[in-house]
């Protein structure tokens, strides 16, 4: 795979993953009512990081935000923090990677700078993905713990009214947001790894000769010394990028011979 393709694909995968992390963070269905004991409930409860909702058979849905910070479980606060950190890092990663993309030319930025930016964005995406995966996993663990605790209570807490009155304990299980979060975190992580791999292909090898552009007087053509197998694809900044009347063009428009860095 070429460096540009690897970098571009890594960027796209990270972007999709990042969008998924945002979607998961905003979704209300982090935990949904377990219907195993009451599959015919007319009232369905589900909860997100920011609010809890109730959907009735009538179609009426009511959501209430968690308007307190102090009263919320520390684990929920931690999950919120992890998801927000993941989003912030993802935003920074996207901004950095846009400037780092090989197919986009910005000013006189050389490839070593792009390589550093690609590596930076890759690391940011990796951390962002890890934050999301950890956040979702912590929440899932919290659900599993609460599920078994409420199951224990369900079978031990029936004696209060001499067994006459049953109290249905609402148990919660994994909601759609958890699966979205896991997949999104994984995609962001994979995208980040791809960006880091692409970075290796962008790093100039000092053992290679630098490409030098020679200009023949009176001709609008750049000559490259064929004996050197010149153009590494990184070239020196002395190359004239505007020798054709094409105006601003992407670097991929220029023909270059493949080198060991163009394939990973």
């Amino acid at each position: 795979m070429s460096v540009t393709a690897c970098q571009g694909l890594g960027f796209v995968v990270s972007l999709i993953g990042f969008a998924g992390i945002i979607a998961a963070t905003c979704m209300d269905q982090w935990s949904t009512q377990d219907l195993y004991n009451n599959p015919v409930t007319a009232v369905f409860n589900y909860q997100g990081l920011w609010r809890s909702c109730v959907r009735e058979s009538s179609g009426f849905t009511e959501c209430r935000g968690y308007f307190t910070l102090l009263g919320l479980p520390a684990m929920l606060q931690a999950v919120r923090a992890l998801m927000i950190v993941g989003i912030v890092l993802g935003v920074i990663g996207i901004l950095v990677s846009i400037f780092a993309l090989k197919c986009i030319r910005i000013g006189s930025m050389d490839d070593s700078a792009k390589a550093k930016m690609t590596l930076t964005s890759g690391i940011l995406f990796i951390i962002s993905g890890i934050c999301a995966i950890i956040g979702v996993s912590v929440f899932a663990n919290m659900l599993v713990t609460n599920f078994w605790m409420s199951t224990a209570n369900m079978y031990s807490g029936m004696g209060g009214m001499g067994g006459m009155v049953q109290t249905v304990q609402t148990r919660y299980t994994f909601g759609a947001a958890l699966f979205v979060g896991w997949v999104a975190g994984g995609l962001t992580l994979i995208g980040g790894v791809m960006m880091c791999i692409a970075c290796r292909g962008l790093t100039p090898d000092d053992s290679n000769f630098k490409a030098v552009s020679y200009h023949a007087s009176g001709q609008n053509v750049a000559y490259r010394p064929g004996g050197f197998k010149a153009s590494t694809g990184f070239g020196s900044n002395t190359r004239n990028k505007k020798i054709y009347d094409g105006g601003a063009r992407t670097e991929d428009d220029e023909q270059s011979h493949p080198t060991k860095y163009d394939y990973v």
Partner: antibody
């Protein structure tokens, strides 16, 4: 003005079939969950069946499960109750109702009488 | 299934008197998600279809006189008429709106002495 008008009731022999209809008007029918409730002569109310907004979920009382089918046609603003294998104990006034907040039934039709007798 | 039990079966009161009727469910009707009780009250006058009075146990339906009030939580609920009027003669039903099958109480018949 919200109106629910039941029709299709009548005298039927045990084991026979009947299809009740409920024509709804004055509200967006497709946006509401609908139910059938019945009342045997001189007795209390008994919930029969419910169909959720999209029509994808239906719920039935144990006494009618497998014999009755609730359905809806949102394009015609009509609710149906197909009653098969009718028994004497199915004799009742059948009401069509609309569900609102709290799963409560805020509007009821005038009812249609179904008599199962030989 | 949730069993709804109403008491008394019938009661006769004088005009202007305060009346209370009860409804008990075999399971709690309190939903932990929104802390609301899924119980409704209906009034059925002779020869008429039932009329919704309360949903969520205590939320009065529009058009219902404020002499009617609903209260209770969990498994025990009450319908109170602060000053009975002649037009209140009816059978009153409570209903479980929490889980299927929706079940009604057997009804409480209110009469005037």
């Amino acid at each position: 003005e919200v109106q629910l008008l039941e029709s299709g009731g009548g005298l039927v022999q045990p084991g026979g079939s009947l299809r009740l209809s409920c024509a709804a008007s004055g509200f967006t029918f497709s946006s509401y969950t609908m139910s059938w409730v019945r009342q045997a002569p001189g007795k209390g109310l008994e919930w029969v069946a419910t169909i959720i907004i999209g029509g994808s979920y239906t719920y039935y009382a144990d006494s009618v499960k497998g014999r009755f089918t609730i359905s809806r046609d949102n394009s015609k603003n009509t609710l149906y109750l197909q009653m098969n294998s009718l028994r004497a104990e199915d004799t009742a006034v059948y009401y069509c109702t609309r569900l609102v907040k709290g799963n409560a039934m805020d509007y009821w039709g005038q009812g249609t009488l179904v008599t199962v007798s030989s | 299934d949730i069993v709804m039990t109403q008491s008394p079966d019938s009661l006769a009161v004088s005009l202007g008197e305060r009346v209370t009727m009860n409804c008990k469910s075999s399971q709690s009707l309190l939903n932990s998600g929104n802390q609301k009780n899924y119980l409704s009250w209906y009034q059925q006058k002779p020869g008429q279809p039932p009329k919704l009075l309360f949903y969520w146990a205590s939320t009065r339906e529009s058009g219902v006189p404020d002499r009617f009030s609903g209260s209770g939580s969990g498994t025990d609920f009450t319908l109170t008429i602060s000053s009975v009027q002649a037009e209140d003669v009816a059978v009153y039903y409570c209903q479980n709106d929490y889980s299927y099958p929706f079940t009604f109480g057997q009804g409480t018949k209110l009469e005037i002495k």
